[in-house]
């Protein structure tokens, strides 16, 4: 490849040469593909709004929970159980949370009057002991409520547990009350204020529009734009029972989806609300089901700091805001159209696949002979020949051989390793169809040469002589006219080739060989046809005519220009041409690979 390129190389354009097949079947397949692809591309463009530039939503959320609950608590005072009624308002059952979340307490366990001192642990598998050996001074178990002193003391009756330094009395390990103490939280309502922004489109809006009726309650079908939600309804939407979840607590997601079309002609930007249970309702008891946390109310009694520990069970509501805002963008449209253009090539890929499949050797040898209805597909072989040009890699070992008594050409693509080329089987390739237009370029003398007196008899004589093999002809010769090669031992086998595979008349005895290959008049015409002002001296004339004769034979017997380049001339033809156009001195060089 040249190292530098000229200016003319820059200003050029390459394009593919195509084969147009006039076929009703393939035409229908092509248009079927094109219509389907075009329909899909248009449908996707409109339905997914792929002509828009989309931007994710940026949002802020603010919530207000409303509702009052009456709680009936069972407490033990001086060994007597009492039922205490208390009213819980928003400040009692909600806790400040960060992010887009709010929490509603639904159940609780109280441990009152705790102060820091030494006391026995609450009895559990890990805290029960039979001697001091079961406790370890300074030991802090992750499940424990304090630091062990190393003593095993009586907890109650004959139960002994490890003594700890902690907030005493130790919180009891007990189940959450059933039913939940704040079961009526089901009727609480929450107002969700959600402001959203699409900075790239310079657009801001909110879920509460000025004309909204503030006394509404959200309903999926009857009031889907109302931002006030009843907690019980949220759970009903997800198929959960509020009373069941309220016992242990849980996590509920409130999803606000904004799918905004910000184009002036189709403007729409309203939220869609949906709900999703986010905690694992199937959790094993050992893996802490529900949602709970502890908090303490601290106070002083007789100058001693005390606290009331409350284990709070409740529902955390996570508000998840997501969505996109889209607006028409010419670049997005162009990019989309560009990305879909390649789909239109699917028709070509599919049709090429059919042509390649139906023209394969497998179909020709196994399917077409047995399947009569498949026979119309044979036409694909014709399409394939027109569409594809097969070329063989021009390796140094590539050679083509043509025997006059065989209809095909043999391709030999291997090293001979001392074997005569005559004996190498090679691969059969079809002989290219003759292009008779080339004959019209030959001089008129070839078409209607008057018979030269005496010559036909000589040819006849030659034919008679050629059939029996002479004593001088090599063993591989089948026509009796071949001569041994003069090349060195290593290259000799390349010239050990006859014009025939089986014994018979030599091709050099044919009328056409004389007229096409040996006619000085024709060869001179061909040389001048290439170079009209060619001046030839005697020695160079013979050399040029000899090589032109070789070429004429190769083109005549091999047809294709590519095959002719790698054609090996039979020994009989080679020596007949050399006899007609001899070299004044020195040896003949023999075949040389053109690449």
């Amino acid at each position: 490849m040249p190292a530098c390129c000229s200016c003319s190389d820059v200003f050029q354009y390459e394009t593919n040469k195509v084969t147009r097949i006039q076929s009703m079947n393939y035409g229908t397949i092509k248009w079927f593909f094109h219509v389907i692809i075009f329909s899909y591309v248009c449908f996707a463009l409109v339905s997914d709004k792929l002509y828009q530039r989309k931007e994710p939503v940026i949002s802020s959320v603010h919530t207000k929970v409303k509702g009052i609950a009456e709680v009936k608590e069972e407490i033990v005072e001086n060994g007597v159980k009492k039922l205490v009624h208390s009213v819980f308002d928003t400040a009692d059952y909600t806790f400040p949370l960060q992010g887009n979340s709010f929490f509603v307490m639904t159940n609780f366990l109280k441990t009152e009057g705790q102060e820091q001192r030494l006391c026995p642990e609450y009895p559990t598998r890990r805290t029960l002991c039979s001697s001091d050996r079961g406790c370890k001074k300074g030991w802090m178990d992750p499940q424990s409520k304090g630091i062990q002193t190393g003593r095993c003391v009586v907890y109650e009756g004959n139960q002994k547990t490890c003594e700890v330094s902690a907030w005493c009395p130790i919180e009891a390990v007990e189940e959450a009350p059933r039913p939940a103490l704040l079961n009526s939280a089901e009727n609480f309502t929450v107002l969700i204020k959600n402001n959203i922004d699409f900075p790239g489109h310079n657009y801001t809006t909110r879920n509460i529009l000025p004309g909204l009726n503030i006394t509404c309650t959200f309903h999926k079908t009857q009031n889907p734009q109302c931002p006030i939600f009843r907690l019980g309804d949220i759970f009903r939407e997800t198929g959960d029972n509020f009373s069941d979840v309220a016992i242990q607590g849980g996590i509920m997601g409130i999803e606000i989806y904004w799918d905004c079309n910000l184009d002036r002609w189709f403007h729409h930007c309203r939220p869609k609300y949906s709900f999703r249970r986010l905690d694992d309702k199937t959790t094993n008891v050992s893996l802490y089901p529900g949602y709970n946390f502890r908090y303490a109310k601290y106070y002083k009694e007789n100058n001693v700091e005390k606290r009331t520990l409350i284990k709070v069970f409740g529902i955390r509501f996570d508000i998840l805001v997501f969505g996109t805002g889209g607006k028409f963008d010419i670049i997005q449209l162009v990019v989309y159209i560009g990305s879909t253009l390649s789909y239109f090539g699917l028709a070509a890929v599919f049709i090429d696949f059919l042509i390649d499949t139906y023209s394969s050797n497998c179909c020709r040898s196994h399917i077409y002979p047995w399947c009569k209805c498949c026979q119309p597909c044979v036409v694909n072989e014709y399409y394939y020949r027109k569409k594809c040009e097969s070329i063989v890699e021009p390796k140094p070992t590539l050679k083509y051989v043509s025997f006059v008594d065989e209809s095909h050409i043999r391709m030999v693509n291997q090293q001979l390793l001392g074997r005569s080329l005559q004996d190498v089987k090679g691969q059969e390739v079809p002989r290219p169809a003759m292009d008779f237009t080339d004959l019209s370029r030959l001089p008129l003398a070839l078409h209607d040469t008057p018979p030269i007196p005496g010559q036909p008899e000589e040819i006849q004589l030659l034919r008679k002589e050629a059939t029996p093999r002479s004593r001088d002809s090599p063993v591989w010769c089948q026509c009796g006219s071949c001569l041994p090669s003069q090349l060195p031992e290593s290259h000799r086998c390349l010239e050990e080739l006859c014009c025939r595979k089986k014994p018979g008349a030599c091709i050099t005895t044919s009328e056409l060989f004389r007229k096409l290959v040996l006619s000085r008049h024709v060869l001179q015409f061909l040389l001048l046809y290439q170079e009209p002002l060619l001046a030839l001296d005697v020695d160079s004339t013979n050399s040029r005519l000899r090589h032109c004769a070789y070429r004429c034979y190769a083109t005549w017997r091999f047809g294709s220009q590519d095959m002719a380049d790698f054609a090996i001339l039979p020994s009989c033809c080679r020596w007949r041409i050399r006899k007609e156009f001899p070299k004044s001195e020195g040896q003949y060089s023999g075949f040389k690979s053109p690449y």
Partner: nanobody, 129 residues
Amino acid sequence: EVQLVESGGGVVQPGGSLRLSCAASGRTFRHYAMGWFRQAPGKEREFVAAISSYGSTDYGDSVKGRFTISRDDAKNTVPLQMNSLKPEDTAVYYCAAADETLGAVPNFRLHEKYEYEYWGQGTLVKVSS
């Protein structure tokens, strides 16, 4: 849930040896601390030996140096090799299992019977001449 079956009990002369074996059912055997306890007639259940799921062992004061506990997680068994047996070793020997899935049992707690959730039916060992 783990089922425990003790075997290997019997009558043996003082100074003799005996090998008890505890076979456990359940795929999660390797997550359990295993212990041997014994109860002589009219006495409290007493700790003999224990091995945690990660292989640390603990022995009762009266059997230290004479008894050896080991575990074979492939076969789900916990053998107790008892050598130099004395008449006071006569008792019903129980195999016990403590779940360590959610946290290891501290070494100083391995001898506490309260740590063990699952118990076998027991096998009798009698040491007499």
